[in-house]
């Protein structure tokens, strides 16, 4: 169902000293700036709904500009316990205390807050990102080293009056920016406690939050300029699938990848892509300003509604998955990467997908909802779309049940 | 400016293995993925395969499976092609280049000679 | 795989001439044809890409047509820092082939 409800206290329509307070671009992430101890530190950090942990970088590393120095804060106090994050590529590690912590381009509020200051990385910080730290916005369930370990936003809720919720408005550029662009480039917003109206057009659409760990949610139909994938909806959710702002493409199961890259490369046959273009390998170029936006299929998401039998859908235009490119030796033209991927841990909803919505993360009612974004890039001919209701049976089926590891089974 | 620089000219022993490097500079590093290239006189240039740097997914051309290994560090912007039970064969230049539309970048060409 | 054949080992040219390089692909390719230019002793430089578009740099003496199955890299005003062997390439699908390359000399 749209927002049509009376208001609740803390989430009145404008949040000015929050607008425009992300920087960054899809393929590096969007960050934004935060305080750390006393006397402040001032901190970059990426604003990411796929994890759980505040971590920022505590040591000299070459990719860093900065970092927290928690011998310089008075407030800092140490836990005394280490944490170790693995990525399938990558890792970090450091040690867990926790120190003053606010936004300033967010609520006028300071917490004391868990944080990681990390020690010791690989393949995590990228160089020319901007950023030096993650905020984890996620829940407790997949914070590390355990969920006993209090994610940033619970900190946050819990010690001030700030309402349990918080939207992103994330701004994809529809071209490349160079360095100095990016830094001087608004990347968009995070609202935290509230909905800004000024962000959005049209209405807002609720999905259920299937499980509190990730944000996960439950797909339960994928069309292709119209036409339905027809897959058992069971393929879309293998093994979830969630809403991630710290990914860049729009990831999908194996299955689902090669059927929608089928029926996305019988939509544009009008032009021959190399192979290594739907693998994101090789880019396309077209002379500048001539990009074919119009041979390349919209790509539509229905999500499960609030309501029993009742879906919505949401709608993506090739400006959000042909994601732009700066290379030198083709500089004269506008290349672009193909960036929807494959993956092996379900479907990712990242910022291809979340650069066309204003996507509002009600934890107080476990949901998630999804509006066309007033920032979105688009053509005079097509633009991005939340639309319902629509009809969808037996939608619970959709959702994937992951075998549990009953561990008192295992020997010890 | 882009630049990719291989690794000094390696002389092996037949049955040894060898690891040359490329090291990228100028770019964002995990943008673009690095393929590596064997050219032997009268032989032409031949694509052994290439890495993303951004997940280290791998993808060999079927001839040089068994032969070559791909891996990247980001920290140091490095990819590395590991060669192994070196034959004459193997002997040739060997080339790092850079994706972007086919291969717009060229590393500066790494001697492999094997040689008892 | 597909078969890049450049049926011409090498071509004779003057200085200030027009000569043409050409490359038959063994199945359709689309436009996703590169050309490189090598030098002995020298890594290949990047000529032309999508058979017609030319890299940054590149003079516009090099000029590259052809989609399908054909392909041909036209150098006019031959110069003498042209003198060097030519490759085709295609990148429209895995594994990445190339020509057997063209060697251009002087008359």
């Known amino acids: 169902e749209t927002d049509e409800e009376p208001e609740e206290p803390g989430r009145r329509g404008s949040f000015v000293e929050m607008v425009d307070n992300l920087r960054g671009k899809s393929g590096q992430g969007y960050y934004v700036e935060m305080t750390v101890g006393s006397p402040p530190q001032t901190l970059n950090i990426l604003v990411d709904t796929g994890s759980s942990n505040f971590a920022v970088g505590a040591a000299p590393h070459p990719f860093l500009h900065r970092y927290y120095q928690r011998q310089l804060s008075s407030t800092y106090r140490d836990l005394r316990k280490g944490v170790y994050v693995p990525y399938t590529q990558g890792k970090w590690e450091g040690e867990l205390g926790t120190d003053l912590v606010s936004i300033p381009h967010g609520p006028n509020v300071t917490v004391r807050a868990n944080i990681a200051a990390i020690t010791e990385s690989d393949k995590f910080f990228i160089n020319g990102s901007n950023w030096e730290g993650i905020l984890g916005l996620a829940y407790a369930e997949i914070a590390r080293p355990d969920d006993s370990l209090e994610p940033f936003f619970d900190s946050l809720v819990k010690q001030t009056h700030v309402p349990n919720l918080f939207s992103l408005q994330l701004c994809g550029a529809g071209f490349p920016l160079n360095q100095s662009e990016v830094l001087a480039s608004v990347g968009g917003s995070m609202i935290i406690g509230g909905i800004d109206h000024s962000l959005y057009t049209g209405s807002l659409w609720y999905t259920p939050i299937r499980r509190e760990w990730y944000y996960e949610v439950i797909i339960v139909r994928v069309e292709i300029n119209g036409q339905d994938l027809k897959m058992d909806c069971k393929e879309y959710n293998y093994d979830k699938s969630i809403v991630d702002s710290g990914t860049t493409n729009l990831r999908l199961p194996k299955k689902v990848f090669e059927a929608a890259v089928k029926s996305i490369k019988a939509a544009s046959s009008t032009e021959k892509f190399p192979d290594g273009f739907w693998l994101g390998e090789q880019l396309v170029c077209w002379q500048a300003g001539t990009t074919p936006w119009n041979i390349f299929p919209v790509i539509s998401l229905y999500l499960m509604g609030e309501v029993t039998n009742q879906s919505f859908r949401i709608t993506i235009l090739p400006q959000q998955y042909l994601r732009p490119v700066e290379d030198v030796a083709t500089s004269q033209d506008d290349c672009y990467k193909f960036a929807i991927s494959q993956s092996s841990t379900g479907t990712v909803m990242g910022a291809v997908i979340m650069e066309g919505f204003y996507v509002v993360f009600d934890r107080a009612r476990k949901r998630i909802g999804f509006a066309v974004s007033a920032c979105h890039v688009h053509d005079e001919f097509r633009t991005a779309a939340v639309e319902g209701p629509f009809v969808t049976l037996d939608m619970e089926d959709c959702g994937y049940n992951i075998p549990q590891t009953d561990e008192s089974t295992l020997m010890t | 400016e882009v630049q990719l620089q291989q690794s000094g000219p390696e002389l092996v022993k037949p049955g040894a293995s060898v690891k040359l490097s490329c090291k990228a500079s100028?770019?964002?590093?995990?943008n673009f993925w690095i393929h590596w290239l064997k050219q032997r006189p009268g032989q032409g240039l031949e694509w052994?395969?290439?890495?993303?740097?951004?997940?280290?997914?791998?993808k060999y051309n079927q001839k040089f499976k068994a032969k070559a290994t791909l891996t990247v560090d980001t920290s140091s912007s490095t990819t590395y092609m590991h060669l192994s039970s070196l034959t004459s064969e193997d002997s040739a230049v060997y080339y790092c280049?850079?994706?972007?539309?086919?291969?717009?970048?060229w590393g500066q060409r790494t001697l492999v000679t094997v040689s008892a | 795989d597909i078969q890049m054949t450049q049926s011409q080992k090498f071509m004779s040219t003057s200085i200030g001439d027009r000569v043409s390089v050409t490359c038959k692909a063994s199945?359709?390719?689309?436009?996703?044809v590169a050309w490189y230019q090598q030098k002995p002793g020298q890594s290949p430089k990047s000529l032309i890409y999508?058979?017609?578009h030319w890299y940054s740099g590149v003079p516009d003496r090099f000029t590259g047509s052809g989609s399908g199955t054909d392909f041909t890299l036209t150098i006019s005003n031959v110069q003498s820092e042209d003198l060097a062997e030519y490759f085709c390439?295609?990148?429209?699908?895995?594994?990445?082939?190339f020509g057997g390359g063209t060697k251009l000399e002087i008359k």
């Open positions: 280049a850079r994706s972007g539309v086919a291969f717009p970048y």
């Open positions: 199945q359709n390719v689309g436009t996703n």
């Open positions: 052994i395969g290439m890495i993303d740097p951004s997940d280290s997914y791998t």
């Open positions: 390439q295609q990148y429209n699908s895995y594994p990445y082939t």
């Open positions: 999508s058979a017609s």
């Open positions: 100028g770019y964002t590093f995990t």
